[in-house]
């Protein structure tokens, strides 16, 4: 029979044959052959693999470093990574929670809707049309675009959610 060019789900192609992938929580020891099944081994303590895989090494569980204000929210298993969170009163800087800050800043293009309190983090909101924020801040709201008209000027460059408008002199047309 023709050697396969594609394999079923949870299989992989190697040496012109389809081998079973290792299940989550296990790593590949040896590929299957004509006569043997794929050989897999469970990940060790503090290791994991979260997908059907052909990895020869398991991934290390994330370390929640207390020196960065991190603590374990959910202990990892052979199939899942450890989830970190911040000490009480502190907030993760990202989804991955790799470090902690007293309160998050709002990125350029976003303004502060509500300043952080002892119990809640900064609440950011996107700057609507007509407003901008060009800084990362835990306190500043979106600022309104400059009104060129009130200065007897015209808009030379449109504003965005991150930049103010640029005003310039009006063209004086001669009769």
């Amino acid at each position: 029979p023709e050697p396969p060019t594609a394999c079923r789900e949870k299989q992989y192609l190697i040496n012109s044959q389809c081998c079973s992938l290792c299940q989550p929580g296990q790593k590949l020891v040896s590929d299957c052959t004509e006569f043997t099944e794929t050989e897999c081994l469970p990940c060790g303590e503090s290791e994991f693999l979260d997908t059907w895989n052909r990895e020869t090494h398991c991934h290390q569980h994330k370390y929640c470093d207390p020196n960065l204000g991190l603590r374990v929210q959910q202990k990892g298993t052979s199939e899942t990574d450890t989830i970190c969170t911040c000490e009480e009163g502190w907030h993760c800087t990202s989804e991955a929670c790799e470090s902690c800050v007293l309160h998050r800043s709002c990125s350029p293009g976003f303004g502060v809707k509500q300043i952080a309190t002892g119990v809640s983090d900064t609440i950011c909101e996107p700057c609507p049309v007509g407003f901008f924020s060009n800084v990362s801040s835990a306190f500043e709201k979106c600022h309104p675009w400059t009104s060129c008209e009130t200065k007897d000027l015209v808009v030379q460059q449109a504003g965005t959610n991150k930049t103010d408008v640029v005003c310039g002199p009006q063209d004086r047309l001669r009769a």
């Epitope: 020196n67 470090s99 902690c100 800050v101 309160h103 800084v135 801040s137 500043e140």
Partner: nanobody, 116 residues
Amino acid sequence: EVQLLASGGGLVQPGGSLRLSCAASGFTFEEEEMIWVRQAPGKGLEWVSAISGSGGGTYYADSVKGRFTISRDNSKNTLYLQMNSLRAEDTAVYYCGKEPFRYDYWGQGTLVTVSS
């Protein structure tokens, strides 16, 4: 390396005043939003006041509004906190920092004790 050194703390009677200073180095001071935070004995960290890079925007926690004034001198890389009408509950170690205020770097604080 970022260095932030707060000074100016001390013992003061209720109703008295103090001016804290914070000498900053290791970063472009005028580009950074700066903050004062404090930690009372046995309590968590609480933000007190903040100021924008230009000094144009100032922000205060409700507990200090009308009594404390934050300012900065970008030519001297120095942040200030003028504290008036001090109360016993203002007793704490005061730290300065740049935003966002990170857990792993607080700098050196200065102790303010308000007591008669």
